[in-house]
Every structure is written in C-alpha cells, then in structure tokens.
Interface confidence: low
C-alpha cells in the first residue's frame, strides 16, 4: 500500500533518525555530516523550546544504541543536556540532579506527543 503522510510522522521514523544522526560526529562523508548537524540542531531546538526529551522520553537514550551514546559516557550524560530543566540563561538548573534523574530537574515527556498533536489535526 502507498505510504500516507501519517507514516512519515510515526515515532519509529523520528526515533531512527534521532538515534542515527543526533550528535553523530563520525559520518562517512561530508553530506552526512551536514545532515547530522542539521538533525542535531533541530533536536536541540525542539527539546529546549518544548521542554521535552527524545521521541518517547529520556528512556530513548537508555534503551537504544545511538550515535549520542557512542560519543558520550552514560554516567556523564545519560541523555542530552537539552533534556535538563534550564534556567533563563539556557543552562541546566542543576546538571548533577539532571544526570541522576531527580524529578523536576529533567524533562520526562517525549517530544513526539508534543509535535504529533498539531500534525494530526491537519
């Protein structure tokens, strides 16, 4: 069957792109590096603006193999710092508490449910 617009906005597709390209600093070619940079910037902006983390939540960075995980030690960065609750200077309120998953210091909502709502209305 033909792919519908809805198929392109499935969480799995978002997840695959995020896991493969977010903070991937070891691409096979320059074109991929350009794409990776674009994906990283988009996700950073999304997570900061919408106060969300990953596609389904912070657990995305724990459950799946990702470029982010190969670039960052799990103990140092269980998830991107953009998942942390920020102050108005756009710096994590308390990085240690965010890393430890202390409620109130990191965003536990996934970004997909925030962006899929507006898309599903059209």
């Amino acid at each position: 069957t033909a792919a519908t617009q809805q198929d392109f906005f499935t969480p799995n597709l978002f997840l695959k792109q995020m896991l493969e390209r977010y903070q991937n600093n070891s691409p096979p070619n320059n074109d991929d590096q350009w794409k990776n940079n674009g994906v990283t910037k988009t996700w950073d902006r999304l997570m900061l603006q919408d106060n969300c983390c990953g596609v389904n939540g912070p657990s995305d960075w724990q459950k799946y193999t990702s470029a982010f995980r190969t670039e960052n030690n799990d103990a140092d960065y269980p998830w991107p710092r953009q998942c942390c609750v920020m102050n108005n200077l756009k710096e994590p309120l308390n990085l240690e508490a965010c890393k430890l998953g202390v409620p109130g210091f990191y965003h536990n909502q996934g970004c997909y449910e925030l962006i899929s709502g507006p898309m599903n209305r059209h």
Epitope: R81, C84, N87, N88, P92, N94
Partner: antibody, heavy 123, light 107 residues
C-alpha cells in the same frame, strides 16, 4: 572541604589600583564558575563579577558599577581567582568575598564563600 | 535590574519560636531564589537555593517556599546559633541581586 582564602585588601587612595587574590582548595577549581561579591560597611551584599570555566571560554560578567574598572581573571593551574581593581572610588570600600557557584549549571547560586578581604578607598 | 526587597530589616524572636522572613522580587524570578546567612563575624553561608532546596549541611529546621515574586524563609525552631542576618538573592537574571537583609535578634 571547600576552602576559599582571599588576600590583597588594604588601604588605597581614590583613583588607585589594587589586586585581590583568592586561593581555592578542596574542589576541582577548573570546572567551576567563580565570583566576587562585596559588602560595603553596614550595607547589603552586592555581586561584582563572575568568570566561567575554560570549557565556557572563561566568559566574564560584571556589575555596571564596576564595568571597565575591574577585571576578573583566574589561573586554573594554581587554583587562583583574581580581581584587578583600577580607578578605585570611595564607594568601592567594602569587604570583598571570593565565592564559588553551586554544583551543576545553575549559575545563580553562591554555594561557598571565603572569609573576605577588606578594601578601604580613602584619601 | 531586578530589585529584591526585604521589608523587615530586623526581627526579634524567642528561642524555640517559628520565624518567617519575607522577600519580594520586582518581577517574576521563576523560583530562582536563594537564601544566605551572615553571622556577626561576617561569615556567609548558603542555606537554601532554588526556593526550597536545602544546601548540604544545613539543618532541616530551615525551609523555603514561594513562587513568582514572593518568597519566604522559615526557621521552625529558633536556636541561639541562628542569630544572624539573612539575605535573599535572585539567580534568575544577571546581574544577580540581593535583598538588603533581615537581622534576626533574640527577644
């Protein structure tokens, strides 16, 4: 145990210069933003200057009252914080505290304070 | 700049009392409010950060609350060693600013 020990205070004439030092120990100095906070005799506390860590390009910030006159700097290899004060005014008379920010990236809290060094600007 | 106002400059209380010190910001500071204790000898210590989080080593009789522009520090059971001046400070926006202080004395 976090320790911050200020030195370099003293009596100086208006328009004169003075350099304050702060020796830090008991923590990884190079990873923390550091601040100077002052208190004029019988008055409240006033934030003066802030310098971030190397990973944040040693970015500096100043209160308007000292901008272009004071310079904050640091020497990570010696765990030292400095405040170069030029063109001093009588209103700069105060106890100057060396202050370390708290853990994490919430820059707005001052977790550890030194005992202070007194600067008196008078003719 | 954000102005921090502590309307009560001095406060008298008895040992064992519950004491509340107030602080108001000139604009919403999103809970970025910290409290400090300054002893008569000039020693300054952080008590509470981000409105209500107790700094390490601070006795549990100290607590903080508030939101928006209005915040308070409470000492639930006043002890002799709590005699000091208490300052609030906003960490929301540079320049970081302090209240003028509330001096706590024994009745």
């Amino acid at each position: 145990e976090v320790q911050l020990v200020e030195s370099g205070g003293g009596l100086v004439q208006p328009k004169g210069s003075l350099k304050l030092s702060c020796a830090a120990s008991g923590f990884s100095f190079n990873t923390y933003a550091m601040n100077w906070v002052r208190q004029a005799p019988g008055k409240g506390l006033e934030w003066v200057a802030r310098i971030r860590s190397k990973s944040n390009n040693y970015a500096t910030y100043y209160a308007d009252s000292v901008k272009d006159r004071f310079t904050i700097s640091r020497d990570d290899s010696e765990s030292m914080l400095y405040l170069q004060m030029n063109n001093l005014k009588t209103e700069d008379t105060a106890m100057y505290y060396c202050v370390r920010q708290g853990d994490g990236y919430y820059v707005g809290w001052f977790a550890y304070w030194g005992q202070g060094t007194l600067v008196t600007v008078s003719a | 700049d954000i102005q921090m106002t502590q309307t009560t400059s001095s406060l008298s209380a008895s040992l064992g009392d519950r004491v509340t010190i107030s602080c108001r910001a000139s604009q919403d500071i999103s809970n970025y409010l910290n409290w400090y204790q300054q002893k008569p000898d000039g020693t300054v210590k952080l008590l509470i950060y981000y409105t209500s989080r107790l700094h390490s080593g601070v006795p549990s009789r100290f607590s903080g609350s508030g939101s928006g522009t209005d915040y308070s520090l409470t000492i639930s059971n006043l002890e002799q060693e709590d005699i000091a001046t208490y300052f609030c400070q906003q960490g929301n926006t540079l320049p970081f600013t302090f209240g003028s202080g509330t001096k706590l004395e024994i009745k």
